[in-house]
C-alpha cells in the first residue's frame, strides 16, 4: 500500500487546515463496461445545432484534457442546410468533478474541483421579449 | 480536522489491499463561480429534441444525486410543434468521475468511478443505410 507522505509541507489526515479529508482509491472502476460513449461521436456534425470541439488542457488537473463544445452557429440548420436564425443553437452544460494536486507537487494529496463544461449543443426556440 | 476512521472494517493508508490510496480534500473548489449552470435549465423544454430529467440517486456515491436526460421522442419537434420522424432526438453522453464509498458505509473511504451520463438531447439527421 502507499504511505501518505510525511513531507511536512504535505498535509495529513490530522491536519486541521485540511478539512474533510478522505482516502480515495485511484483504481478507477468503470460502470459502463458494455457501453461505448464514442458511438455518439459524430453527433457534432449531424446535429441541427452542430458544434466544434476544443481542447482544454491543464497538466496539473485530472483529466488533463477535456474536450469542450462550442456551437458553430447562433441559429440552427434547417431542412435546406441553411442557418435559421429564428432558432438558437445553445450549449448543454454540465458540472463535472476533476482532481487537482493540492498543495502542488505533493504526490498523494489532492483536492476535488468542480468545473462547468459544454458537452454539446441543442436547438431551442428563442425566448421572445415583447416590448410593451 | 477529520480523523480517518479506525474502524477495522474500513481501510487506512497502510492497507495493502487498498492500493493507490491518496488523500482527497472534499471541500470542493468551484472554478465556475461566475457562471450559473441553471441558466440552461429550461433548454430541456425549449429544445427541438426535448428531454426529461430523471433523478439517479445513490447514497453510496458522491455526488449522490445525478440528473439523467431521456429524450422525449424518437423524432424532433418541427416548426408546427409536431414530431418529425425524419430527424432523430439523441442523447449527448459524457463520462464523468464520481466517488463511491468502498467498502460501503465507510464514511471516509472512497473509490474513483467512471460513469456514463446523458446530459441532454440534440436533433440529428439520421444515418440512412441504402440497401444494395
Amino acid at each position: 500500500g502507499i504511505t501518505i507522505p510525511r513531507n511536512p509541507g504535505c498535509p495529513n489526515s490530522e491536519d486541521k487546515n485540511f478539512p474533510r479529508t478522505v482516502m480515495v482509491n485511484l483504481n478507477i472502476h468503470n460502470r459502463n463496461t458494455n457501453t461505448n460513449p464514442k458511438r455518439s461521436s459524430d453527433y457534432y456534425n449531424r446535429s441541427t445545432s452542430p458544434w466544434n470541439l476544443h481542447r482544454n488542457e491543464d497538466p496539473e488537473r485530472y483529466p488533463s484534457v477535456i474536450w469542450e463544445a462550442q456551437c458553430r452557429h447562433l441559429g440552427c440548420i434547417n431542412a435546406d442546410g441553411n442557418v435559421d436564425y429564428h432558432m438558437n443553437s445553445v450549449p448543454i452544460q454540465q458540472e463535472i468533478l476533476v482532481l487537482r494536486r493540492e498543495p502542488p507537487h505533493c504526490p498523494n494529496s489532492f483536492r476535488l474541483e468542480k468545473i462547468l463544461v459544454s458537452v454539446g449543443c441543442t436547438c431551442v426556440t428563442p425566448i421572445v421579449h415583447h416590448v410593451q | 480536522g477529520i480523523t480517518i476512521p479506525r474502524n477495522p472494517g474500513c481501510p487506512n493508508s497502510e492497507d495493502k489491499n487498498f492500493p493507490r490510496t491518496v488523500m482527497v480534500n472534499l471541500n470542493i473548489h468551484n472554478r465556475n463561480t461566475n457562471t450559473n449552470p441553471k441558466r440552461s435549465s429550461d433548454y430541456y423544454n425549449r429544445s427541438t429534441s426535448p428531454w426529461n430529467l430523471h433523478r439517479n440517486e445513490d447514497p453510496e456515491r458522491y455526488p449522490s444525486v445525478i440528473w439523467e436526460a431521456q429524450c422525449r421522442h424518437l423524432g424532433c419537434i418541427n416548426a408546427d410543434g409536431n414530431v418529425d420522424y425524419h430527424m432523430n432526438s439523441v442523447p449527448i453522453q459524457q463520462e464523468i468521475l464520481v466517488l463511491r464509498r468502498e467498502p460501503p458505509h465507510c464514511p471516509n473511504s472512497f473509490r474513483l468511478e467512471k460513469i456514463l451520463v446523458s446530459v441532454g438531447c440534440t436533433c440529428v439527421t439520421p444515418i440512412v443505410h441504402h440497401v444494395q
Partner: antibody
Framework: QVQLQQSGPGLVKPSQTLSLTCAIS??????????WGWIRQSPGRGLEWLGR?????????DYAVSVKSRITINPDTSKNQFSLQLNSVTPEDTAVYYC??????????????WGQGTLVTVSS | DIVLTQSPATLSLSPGERATLSCRAS???????LAWYQQKPGQAPRLLIY???NRATGVPARFSGSGSGTDFTLTISSLEPEDFATYYC??????????FGQGTKVEIK
C-alpha cells in the same frame, strides 16, 4: 481486430525526406476515441514519441519539440491511413519507426496497437 | 520534458522468481497516464499495464502495476520463460509531453 500495417522505404539519403505510411484496418483514422501516432526506437535514443494526429470535429496535430520543425503527420481518410514525413534527415534519424494507436479517452492514454515497425537507415 | 528513469537496467532472475521493476519520474505524473510495455527482440512493444495498475486485455494476472506521484512499479509475481524481455514505462503529461523510460531488461540467470 485492429491492425496497423506499415510501408515505406528502408533507406533514405541524408538531407532527404523520410516518408512512411500506416494503413489501419478494424478502426477509422477519423475515430474520436483514438489518436494515431509515430514512435521511433534507436540504440542511442531508446523509444521516442514523435507526434500524433486526432480528429475531434477537426484535425489536431501534436509534434514532439525535438522534431517539430521537420515533421508532418497527415491523415488519408479515403484510404483509412496516415503518414509520417520527416524532412532534412541525418544519420541520427536512423531508427526503427513504429506507428501506433493511442487510446485517447479523457481518463486514460496509452498505445494499445502497434505496427510491425520499419527500420529506416539514413545513409548516402 | 519529464524524464522516466527505470531501474535496474538489467535484472537477472530464474523462472519462477519474482521480478520488481521500478520507474521513477523526474516530477509528478498522473498515475492514470502511466503505462508499461513489454518488448521482445525484433518485435513491437506490447501494452501490459495502463493507468499504472490496469492490466491490458489478455495480459496474465502475474503482471501487476502500482504506484503514484513519481514512483511506479511493475511486478511479475512468478517469471515464466516467455516473460524474459525488455520492459518500458511511459507517461503522458500533456499533449506535447509523452516520454518513455530507457527500459529494464529481464534476462535468465
Amino acid at each position: 481486430q485492429v491492425q496497423l500495417q506499415q510501408s515505406g522505404p528502408g533507406l533514405v539519403k541524408p538531407s532527404q525526406t523520410l516518408s512512411l505510411t500506416c494503413a489501419i484496418s478494424g478502426d477509422s483514422v477519423s475515430s474520436s476515441s483514438a489518436a494515431w501516432g509515430w514512435i521511433r526506437q534507436s540504440p542511442g535514443r531508446g523509444l521516442e514519441w514523435l507526434g500524433r494526429i486526432s480528429y475531434r470535429s477537426k484535425w489536431y496535430n501534436d509534434y514532439a519539440v525535438s522534431v517539430k520543425s521537420r515533421i508532418t503527420i497527415n491523415p488519408d481518410t479515403s484510404k483509412n491511413q496516415f503518414s509520417l514525413q520527416l524532412n532534412s534527415v541525418t544519420p541520427e534519424d536512423t531508427a526503427v519507426y513504429y506507428c501506433a494507436r493511442e487510446v485517447d479517452s479523457m481518463y486514460y492514454s496509452y498505445f494499445d496497437i502497434w505496427g510491425q515497425g520499419t527500420l529506416v537507415t539514413v545513409s548516402s | 520534458d519529464i524524464v522516466l528513469t527505470q531501474s535496474p537496467a538489467t535484472l537477472s532472475l530464474s523462472p519462477g522468481e519474482r521480478a520488481t521493476l521500478s520507474c521513477r519520474a523526474s516530477q509528478n505524473v498522473w498515475a492514470f497516464y502511466l503505462a508499461w510495455y513489454q518488448q521482445k527482440p525484433g518485435q513491437a512493444p506490447r501494452l501490459l499495464i495502463y493507468g499504472a495498475s490496469n492490466r491490458a486485455t489478455g495480459v496474465p494476472a502475474r503482471f501487476s502495476g502500482s504506484g503514484s506521484g513519481t514512483d511506479f512499479t511493475l511486478t511479475i509475481s512468478s517469471l515464466e520463460p516467455e516473460d524474459f524481455a525488455t520492459y518500458y514505462c511511459q507517461q503522458y503529461r500533456s499533449t506535447l509531453s509523452l516520454t518513455f523510460g530507457q527500459g529494464t531488461k529481464v534476462e535468465i540467470k
